[in-house]
Interface confidence: low
């Protein structure tokens, strides 16, 4: 015998208290698939979270972060404070990058400047708290058409800085 609940579409639930008829999900709840015996509670985007997409009877709400914060975690499960370029977030708030390190984003940690001498290249432009060192070409690389600068190191995956 076919389960009568399998006929209940998304946006409804199979109500055992009403002889397994399909009832609409109550306010602030949803079912994204058919045949569900309960509806899931909608996510509330409160405080530092703000609504990116409203809940509907068939889909959960989606949150992002208020200005000055950025999302962390799957589905924006956390909001982390933004810092200025040249800073990183610590337990005591935003702190300037130490000498020899930089951060060119509003999130993430300060990273060491590129060591041009390890690659046998001269420093073309000094680093700052907000910008990596720019290495020049090797003396032997100064041939027509050769790239004259090395791009900065790739940004690390955004996340919590060491606390």
């Amino acid at each position: 015998l076919q389960d009568p609940c399998s006929n209940c579409p998304a946006g409804t639930f199979c109500d055992n208290n009403r002889n397994q008829i399909c009832s609409p999900c109550p306010p602030n709840s949803f079912s994204s698939a058919g045949g569900q015996r309960t509806c899931d509670i909608c996510r509330q985007c409160k405080g530092v979270f703000r609504t990116r997409k409203e809940c509907s009877s068939t889909s959960n709400a989606e949150c992002d972060c208020t200005p000055g914060f950025h999302c962390l975690g799957a589905g924006c499960s956390m909001c982390e404070q933004d810092c200025k370029q040249g800073q990183e977030l610590t337990k005591k708030g935003c702190k300037d990058c130490c000498f020899g390190t930089f951060n060119d984003q509003k999130r993430g940690i300060c990273r060491p400047w590129t060591n041009c001498s390890l690659a046998g290249k001269p420093v073309l432009m000094n680093g700052t708290k907000a910008r990596d060192v720019v290495c020049g070409p090797r003396p032997a690389d100064l041939s027509p058409g050769a790239s004259s600068v090395t791009p900065p190191a790739p940004a690390r995956e955004p996340g919590h800085s060491p606390q």
């Epitope: 609409p24 999900c25 109550p26 306010p27 602030n28 709840s29 909608c42 509330q44 985007c45 409160k46 609504t51 990116r52 997409k53 409203e54 809940c55 509907s56 009877s57 068939t58 889909s59 709400a61 989606e62």
Partner: antibody
Framework: QSLEESGGRLVTPGTPLTLTCTVS????????MSWVRQAPGKGLEWIGY?????SLYYASWAKGRFTISRTSTTVDLKMTSLTTEDTATYFC???????????WGPGTLVTVSS | DIVMTQTPASVSEPVGGTVTINCQAS??????LAWYQQKPGQRPKRLIY???DLASGVPSRFSASGSGTEYALTISDLESADAATYYC????????????FGGGTEVVVK
């Protein structure tokens, strides 16, 4: 982020009329949208919703005579069989189950008179 | 449909005073309640959502509480700029109960 209603004008009873709410700064795929009206000197009266999936909800008194639809950047309210009782400022508003109506347009005036 | 009964219809208080507006729902509305302020010729402005959460940019002089069928908005330290009509609003609709506004309360600041 803003809403702007248009289409309000003086019409005679029985004339159909469509109002348009133009949205900017956000996507209609992410928010519920409502139409609300306010007769001169009276309170706010909810007409209906369109949710993020395009599902429609209407006040019981509005079913059959009012129809809400949307495009990518507009939400329309189609009104039929207008009577003098429908004379009001019509507002579109953004919001749904989470926050109430957090953003409103300035409104557009519909006057039904013979 | 849900019916929202708002009282009083009008209230007058001096600058610096306190006003409380009540809103009763015909059924339990589970705190899906917002409060709006509307001045003549203007669009409504949301003050409160979720029965008690203050909308961003709204002064803390505005506060609200309630659950089930009984809700209230309180304005303390009244300012002349608070003169307006205030509406309560039940805003959940998936249950089929519909959306409803209270009839409004006019606040006059003396």
């Amino acid at each position: 982020q803003s809403l702007e209603e248009s289409g309000g004008r003086l019409v005679t009873p029985g004339t159909p009329l469509t109002l348009t709410c133009t949205v900017s700064g956000f996507s209609l795929n992410d928010y519920w949208m409502s139409w609300v009206r306010q007769a001169p000197g009276k309170g706010l009266e909810w007409i209906g919703y369109i949710d993020v999936g395009g599902s429609l909800y209407y006040a019981s008194w509005a079913k059959g005579r009012f129809t809400i639809s949307r495009t990518s950047t507009t939400v329309d309210l189609k009104m039929t069989s207008l009577t003098t009782e429908d004379t009001a400022t019509y507002f579109c508003a953004r919001g749904g189950l989470t926050y109430g109506f957090d953003l409103w347009g300035p409104g557009t005036l519909v006057t039904v008179s013979s | 449909d849900i019916v929202m009964t708002q009282t009083p219809a009008s209230v007058s208080e001096p600058v610096g005073g306190t006003v409380t507006i009540n809103c009763q729902a015909s059924e339990d509305i589970s705190s899906y309640l917002a409060w709006y302020q509307q001045k003549p010729g203007q669009r409504p402005k949301r003050l409160i959502y979720g029965a008690s959460d203050l909308a961003s940019g709204v002064p803390s002089r505005f506060s609200a509480s309630g659950s089930g069928t009984e809700y209230a908005l309180t304005i303390s330290d009244l300012e002349s700029a608070d003169a307006a009509t205030y509406y309560c609003h039940y805003y959940a609709t998936i249950s089929g109960l519909g959306v409803a506004f209270g009839g409004g309360t006019e606040v006059v600041v003396k």
